[in-house]
């Protein structure tokens, strides 16, 4: 079925939100830990798969919704389930920073959607 998202967030908007929540922050979500993920395996869905488990943290809700909107896109967002590193947990802020670094690289090289 067609995308339910109107309009969908852009990579640029996602980057802006990730910058917004990480700047001058040493921690996010009271230091909550999440599974580390391989962002190359469909980055939006991979990141969402880990972050979906974080609750009671308003700081990342907009990021969660943006990732969900992008992950819901078919087929461009990459529905492939991520490879989760079940033995590695990292802080939410580290995952978000990793995502920001990765998304910036994708954006710079124009390899998206």
């Amino acid at each position: 079925s067609p995308s339910p998202v109107t309009p969908s967030p852009t990579l640029k908007e996602l980057i802006e939100e990730l910058v917004n929540i990480t700047q001058n922050q040493a921690s996010l979500c009271n230091g909550s830990m999440v599974w580390s993920v391989n962002l190359t395996a469909g980055m939006y869905c991979a990141a969402l798969e880990s972050l979906i488990n974080v609750s009671d943290c308003s700081a990342i809700q907009r990021t969660q919704r943006m990732l969900k909107a992008l992950c819901s896109q078919k087929p461009a967002a990459g529905q492939i389930s991520s490879e989760r590193s079940r033995d590695t947990k990292i802080e939410v802020i580290q995952l978000v920073k990793n995502l920001l670094t990765y998304v910036r690289g994708v954006y710079r090289h124009g390899n998206f959607r």
């Epitope: 979906i52 609750s55 919704r65």
Partner: antibody, heavy 119, light 107 residues
Framework: EVQLVQSGAEVVKPGASVKVSCKTS????????IYWVRQAPGAGLEWIGY????????TYNQNFKDRVTLTADKSTSTAYMELSSLRAGDIAVYYC????????????WGQGTLVTVSS | DIVMTQTPLSLSVSPGETASISCKAS??????LAWFRQKPGQSPQALIY???NRYPGVPDRFSGSGSGTDFTLRISRVEAEDTGVYYC?????????FGAGTKVELK
């Protein structure tokens, strides 16, 4: 305490539009989206979409995309849902809601607004 | 869209017994599954989020379990106030979709 108070019942003619309001209080309006869900008589729940009052961003269910418009007025902490080209199948109770604890899980609901389509 | 199949459609339980409601998704939800109850003439009430987490004020008689595509809501020691229609909701992908509902009544 989070509260969402909706406008009263509406009776509208087929083909017309309806605009339902949802006035919020007890939290910062721009912190969380306002979701809209409808329920036809004797039926289940159907998600319409949400608006993020922070930036006006919207996400719609494709089933409603061409007929629904979600807006938000930050000055009054009020969200609106306008549905156009109404038909008999749109007769339902329309709810607004917000999600605070878990993203997209609507835990605070308005009382509902019954929209009846009748000529 | 993700289709949520809820069973049974109705359930009659004696007070003190356990009620179980099943919800199956058409694709993997990870942990993005919630449960609601709606009483006649009232707005829905959120009970459980992320499979098994109860909202404040929800009795511990309510428990959620499952993973992937198969989820269950259990209500132990059912009381009269537990009657109503229960819905599951997937919040893994947009559009958010609900199950058709399960009507729980007392014998």
């Amino acid at each position: 305490e989070v509260q969402l108070v909706q406008s009263g019942a509406e009776v509208v003619k087929p083909g017309a539009s309806v605009k339902v309001s949802c006035k919020t209080s007890g939290y910062s309006f721009t912190d969380y989206p306002i979701y809209w869900v409808r329920q036809a008589p004797g039926a289940g729940l159907e998600w319409i979409g949400y608006i993020d009052p922070y930036n006006g961003g919207t996400t719609y269910n494709q089933n409603f995309k061409d007929r629904v418009t979600l807006t938000a007025d930050k000055s009054t902490s009020t969200a609106y849902m306008e549905l156009s080209s109404l038909r008999a199948g749109d007769i339902a109770v329309y709810y607004c809601a917000t999600a605070v604890v878990a993203t997209d899980v609507m835990e605070n609901w308005g009382q509902g607004t019954l929209v009846t389509v009748s000529s | 869209d993700i289709v949520m199949t809820q069973t049974p459609l109705s359930l009659s339980v004696s007070p003190g017994e356990t009620a179980s409601i099943s919800c199956k998704a058409s694709q993997n939800l990870r942990n993005a599954l919630a449960w609601f109850r709606q009483k006649p003439g009232q707005s829905p009430q959120a009970l459980i989020y992320l499979v098994s987490n109860r909202y404040p004020g929800v009795p511990d008689r309510f428990s959620g379990s499952g993973s992937g595509t198969d989820f269950t809501l259990r209500i132990s020691r059912v009381e009269a106030e537990d009657t109503g229609v229960y819905y599951c909701l997937q919040h893994w992908q947009y559009p958010l979709t609900f199950g058709a509902g399960t009507k729980v009544e007392l014998k």
